[in-house]
Interface confidence: low
């Protein structure tokens, strides 16, 4: 949950690609004003997930979740939260 | 803001070699089945995407990272 808060649009696009849902991918890419060539490129990546099946999608989703919830990322998230708290305190 | 480790993973998926990408994945999930899957996906992307496609995908990532939704 915390990871998606850090950059929700990234996880929207990633899970749309890995899920193999073209409509969902189009909707996500519209949010960042992706051009037609950019959409084509992202669909080629999506094709790889579709071709390799459900297990492949689950495994890669697991990798992304593991990286996003690793100490490398969580340490960063905690640091950012501390910085935000400092800024909020200073702003009062 | 996106976590640098995630950014690196995605960058290597597009612009790294299969070895570099798999080594990066192994730092987080060293299961043989996961690493084999990572290599298969990486090889598939390398086979399907031209250099221009990869530039376009990187451009999408730039738009994502600079989006207000990130």
């Amino acid at each position: 949950v915390k990871m998606a808060e850090t950059c929700p649009i990234f996880y929207d696009v990633f899970f749309a690609v890995a899920n193999g849902n073209e409509l969902l991918l189009d909707l996500s890419l519209t949010k960042v004003n992706a051009t037609e060539p950019e959409r084509t490129a992202m669909k080629k990546i999506q094709d790889c997930y579709v071709e390799n099946g459900l297990i492949s999608r689950v495994l890669d989703g697991l990798v992304m979740t593991t990286i996003s919830s690793s100490k490398d990322c969580m340490g960063e998230a905690v640091q950012n939260t501390v910085e935000d708290l400092k800024l909020n305190t200073l702003g009062r | 803001e996106i976590c640098p480790a995630v950014k690196r993973d995605v960058d290597l998926f597009l612009t790294g070699t299969p070895d570099e990408y798999v080594e990066q994945v192994a730092q987080y999930k060293a299961l043989p089945v996961v690493l084999e899957n990572a290599r298969i996906l990486k090889n598939c992307v390398d086979a399907k995407m031209t250099e221009e496609d990869k530039e376009n995908a990187l451009s999408v990532l730039d738009k994502i990272y600079t989006s207000p939704l990130c």
Epitope: - | G16, E20, R39, C44
Partner: antibody, heavy 121, light 106 residues
Framework: EVQLVESGGGLVKPGGSLRLSCAAS????????MNWIRQAPGKGLEWVSY????????YYADSVKGRFTISRDNAKNSLFLQMSSLRAEDTAVYYC??????????????WGQGTLVTVSS | EIVMTQSPDFQSVTPKEKVTITCRAS??????LHWYQQKPDQSPKLLIK???QSFSGVPSRFSGSGSGTDFTLTINSLEAEDAATYYC????????FGQGTKVEIK
């Protein structure tokens, strides 16, 4: 200019040991995967071993597994190949080679000039 | 282990002729395929990396194509200096060379 210079080759008896070195210059050594590749006299190229940039990932061809050890010293821009239990079929020119990267067409695979290892009694 | 099968083993060609060398991988290797040229008593020189990327300084008559399992090296209008042995190398999973193709000038 990228340069790779191998040394340490020579004549050795079967069962003996030898340590090859490769001195790298002209690029950021610690950024690249490095390989040892060999070529027996009059034969084709055979990949021997590679080591990742950090040294975390190491792989060997089945023909040398358990007998050869690859290592690197990033501080000294050096690559090594420790060879033991040498056999006549290990006789070859040994090349040190730098891997390329996908996204920069100037960063190709570079090779040294090679060092000859002869295993004979 | 990925096996690389190169063909033909030998080719005798007249100058200005077009040369085609193929390399087949036993399983998909994406675009992780490189082509080398080796002349007698010299170390191999990279011609094409990642299936189709020309390496800097390599004459434009050398080109590469293919992805997945089938790859081709093409030498358009062969020159005398192109007499050499050509090898393909896969770097998708470990490293494997093809057995080589010797190109001789008639």
């Amino acid at each position: 200019e990228v340069q790779l210079v191998e040394s340490g080759g020579g004549l050795v008896k079967p069962g003996g040991s030898l340590r090859l070195s490769c001195a790298a210059s002209g690029f950021t050594f610690s950024d690249y995967y490095m390989n040892w590749i060999r070529q027996a006299p009059g034969k084709g190229l055979e990949w021997v071993s590679y080591i990742s940039s950090s040294g975390n990932s190491i792989y060997y061809a089945d023909s040398v597994k358990g007998r050869f050890t690859i290592s690197r010293d990033n501080a000294k821009n050096s690559l090594f190949l420790q060879m033991s239990s040498l056999r006549a079929e290990d006789t070859a020119v040994y090349y040190c080679a730098r891997d390329g990267r996908y996204n920069d067409r100037r960063r190709g695979y570079y090779w040294g000039q090679g060092t000859l290892v002869t295993v004979s009694s | 282990e990925i096996v690389m099968t190169q063909s033909p083993d030998f080719q005798s060609v007249t100058p200005k002729e077009k040369v085609t060398i193929t390399c087949r991988a036993s399983q998909s290797i994406g675009s992780s395929l490189h082509w080398y040229q080796q002349k007698p008593d010299q170390s191999p020189k990279l011609l094409i990396k990642y299936a189709s990327q020309s390496f800097s300084g390599v004459p434009s008559r050398f080109s590469g194509s293919g992805s997945g399992t089938d790859f081709t090296l093409t030498i358009n209008s062969l020159e005398a200096e192109d007499a050499a042995t050509y090898y393909c190398l896969q770097s998708s999973s470990l490293r494997t060379f093809g057995q080589g193709t010797k190109v001789e000038i008639k």
